[in-house]
């Protein structure tokens, strides 16, 4: 499956939108930095077949979409930017879903990377727990925004490697 060129443009647009969403000085939030244990090894792209990589990417984008679709998120961010960001993620999900079906086959379940998908889900559970513990404070959201920018950058790099393999 060849992800359309618009997909990588969408990736960049999502990162730009996320960068624009910042509302307070980041310097005031240093004390709130947190190690969420991003599963970097799931995004290095070496041990994966393409089908596995695509389903991990899909999970990453899906979880990001879910995180920024909550009521708490709506209260934290400027609405028009949030809507544009969610639209970009939704388009990426559609692209990836088409690829998952094509690569894995409609009947086949990608059991081989359940651990990888679970690692991504647990990562987002830790992010949600952190936000809850910090009572969804502005600084907590800034830290999460910075973390998601970093994890989306890893996703973008994995997609670039997948395209080079084609």
């Amino acid at each position: 499956c060849d992800l359309p060129q618009t997909h990588s443009l969408g990736n960049r647009r999502a990162l730009i939108l996320l960068a624009q969403m910042g509302r307070i000085s980041h310097f005031s939030c240093l004390k709130d930095r947190h190690d969420f244990g991003f599963p970097e090894e799931e995004f290095d792209g070496h041990q994966f077949q393409k089908a596995q990589a695509i389903s991990v990417l899909h999970e990453m984008i899906q979880q990001t979409f879910n995180l920024f679709s909550t009521e708490d998120s709506s209260a934290a961010w400027e609405q028009s930017l949030l809507e544009k960001f969610s639209t970009e993620l939704y388009q990426q999900l559609n692209d990836l879903e088409a690829c998952v079906i094509q690569e894995v086959g409609v009947e086949e379940t990608p059991l081989m990377n359940e651990d990888s998908i679970l690692a991504v889900r647990k990562y987002f559970q830790r992010i949600t727990l952190y936000l809850t513990e910090k009572k969804y404070s502005p600084c907590a959201w800034e830290v999460v925004r910075a973390e998601i920018m970093r994890s989306l950058s890893f996703s973008t790099n994995l997609q670039k490697r997948l395209r080079r393999k084609d």
Partner: antibody, heavy 121, light 107 residues
Framework: EVQLVQSGAEVKKPGESLKISCKGS????????IGWVRQMPGKGLEWMGI????????RYSPSFQGQVTISADKSISTAYLQWSSLKASDTAMYYC??????????????WGQGTLVTVSS | DIQMTQSPSSLSASVGDRVTITCRAS??????LNWYQQKPGKAPKLLIY???SLQSGVPSRFSGSGSGTDFTLTISSLQPEDFATYYC?????????FGQGTKVEIK
Amino acid sequence: EVQLVQSGAEVKKPGESLKISCKGSGYSFTSYWIGWVRQMPGKGLEWMGIIDPSDSDTRYSPSFQGQVTISADKSISTAYLQWSSLKASDTAMYYCARHPGLAWAPDFDYWGQGTLVTVSS
Amino acid sequence: DIQMTQSPSSLSASVGDRVTITCRASQSINRFLNWYQQKPGKAPKLLIYAASSLQSGVPSRFSGSGSGTDFTLTISSLQPEDFATYYCQQAIDLPFTFGQGTKVEIK
């Protein structure tokens, strides 16, 4: 490959102005902050200040506030440190280094090679 | 500003020795502490971040520990290339202050 490349050594007279640079490459320049560190001859490291190139938000150490100006041009992935009126006591090696901001990653993991500034009459 | 105090300011040791450098913060910095190595004429190099995380590419003989106000950098078996000056730095609040440095010299 991540690199921070600083401008070359400078010899200046007291009262002159100066702007030194730090060019980032091999990574997303706006995703990392850039910090500046001074090291006077035979002395330790002194933290001067930091800039977020994404919006040019800047903070200075009280010791350097009003003495220097930190800026950045994200279109050319370059941060700057400048003086409007140099003093002999500004003679030092100046380093830039990148910081991951609020994301969880190693702090100041890449450094420039340093710019030696000599101020002498 | 948070003050960082390193001890000792210098030490002499032999190859193979176990070396310990301590760093104390004037107030709690949680685990937001970095350790750097600097050799003459070179830029500092990050060894340890977040008090105990080993930076990629740094030999495992280097380790860091501590939280709150008291921190330690340990070199388990000193190698010839380890003779240098070591600095701690707090990273919880601006300005990010450094310790005054510890020079490790050959005995």
